[in-house]
Interface confidence: medium
Amino acid sequence: AVNGTSRFTCFYNSRANISCVWSQDGALQDTSCQVHAWPDRRRWNQTCELLPVSQASWACNLILGTPDSQKLTAVDIVTLRVMCREGVRWRMMAIQDFKPFENLRLMAPISLQVVHVETHRCNISWKISQASHYFERHLEFEARTLSPGHTWEEAPLMTLKQKQEWICLETLTPDTQYEFQVRVKPLQGEFTTWSPWSQPLAFRTKPAALGKDT
């Protein structure tokens, strides 16, 4: 038997992926465990193999279909179970009645690109990936810019309280290397959280023209 505190957390990417992390203090590293998904009103079920991510936590992704297929809705309830092998049989270690649209975490925004760059400003655009059409425009974004000599953690957050897939960064320093990241969150869902940050986009502002004030 496996004793200790158990934590089982899952998020739905709003299309066809449920990502789960299971933490169990005192769990045996060599135990084979899976997550089983049983929807309340669908003709499918799905399983993924939990793989270790640290000393006492495991993760896996339930792939429900092709990346952009809408596999679940706001009224679905999916029973998620952690099942671990004990000899010849499986033992249930954790269970939750998962409401996908209450537990959302979207994929990180993609296709970041510089639309226009000047000496003091830069216009950047991006796209959201695998986000449900159900959200319509009910999304918000956070963005941050890494300037020289600072860390990402020190970068001030810029909030876009609407579905706006671009930003105009102002008051930048000429001829300076920057990096930019953005993340997205639906307005829906009690336990919904921010997506991972996008891959950083590196850009450089234009040098100031000679003889001009900066």
């Epitope: 049983w38 309340d40 003709r43 079920n45 009224v75 009645d97």
Partner: antibody, heavy 119, light 106 residues
């Protein structure tokens, strides 16, 4: 064989309480969601709520706050606790389960138990 | 809540007749079911997911439709089909049923 058997119905006064039981056999209540549905005399079917395999519950707003669904895993039994009963709660109460695995629709029903609310 | 409206509320037909019942939803639904309820008995699932026959159900029963409009058909009415038929949606909670259609033999 999947079977559901309701009990606990009877005559109760307005404002009173009653607890209905639904004994399940042929499956584990921790593996399937079970629903409560009622039917007033000569009327149609009304969904009251459900308890999912993980133990969370969902209710029809028409009865939320007065009715509570619970279960005893060791007895493989579901319960419907009904408080502040009114004359309009008079009905046959059914427990029902969807079919195997992810089979939508109520494939399994109990025989029903009659609750009469009257003074 | 989604309202499910069945028509007709009752009908009388002869043995061998084709019988059709319609179910109109107040908004679009994705998952529709049909049940048969004989007098004094619990309902019985006939059709799931709009058009699929439940286990052990005779092939004379069928369902079709999409969006807000659904149809249930008995291709050749039999004496044992005397019952009330209900549609039900499972697209959003609370789950809701139609008011029922009572089928009698002429």
């Amino acid at each position: 064989e999947v079977q559901l058997l309701e009990s606990g119905g009877g005559l109760v006064q307005p404002g009173g309480s009653l607890r209905l039981s639904c004994a399940a056999s042929g499956f584990s209540v921790t593996s399937y969601g079970v629903h409560w549905i009622r039917q007033a005399p000569g009327k149609g079917l009304e969904w009251l709520g459900a308890i999912w395999s993980g133990g969370s519950t969902q209710y029809n707003a028409a009865v939320k706050g007065r009715f509570t669904i619970s279960r005893d895993n060791s007895k493989n039994t579901l319960y419907l606790q009904m408080n502040s009963l009114r004359a309009e709660d008079t009905a046959v109460y059914y427990c029902a389960r969807a079919g195997d695995a992810n089979y939508d629709g109520f494939a399994y029903w109990g025989q029903g138990t009659l609750v009469t609310v009257s003074s | 809540d989604i309202q499910m409206t069945q028509s007709p509320s009752s009908l009388s037909a002869s043995v061998g007749d084709r019988v059709t019942i319609t179910c109109q939803a107040s908004q679009s639904v994705s998952f529709l079911y049909w049940y048969q309820q004989r007098p004094g008995k619990a309902p019985r699932l006939l059709i799931y997911d709009t058009s699929n026959l439940a286990s052990g159900v005779p092939s004379r029963f069928s369902g079709s439709g999409s969006g807000t409009s659904y149809t249930f058909t008995i291709s050749s009415l039999q004496p044992e089909d005397i019952a009330t038929y209900y549609c039900q949606q499972w697209s959003t909670y609370p789950l809701t049923f139609g008011q029922g259609t009572k089928v009698e033999i002429k």
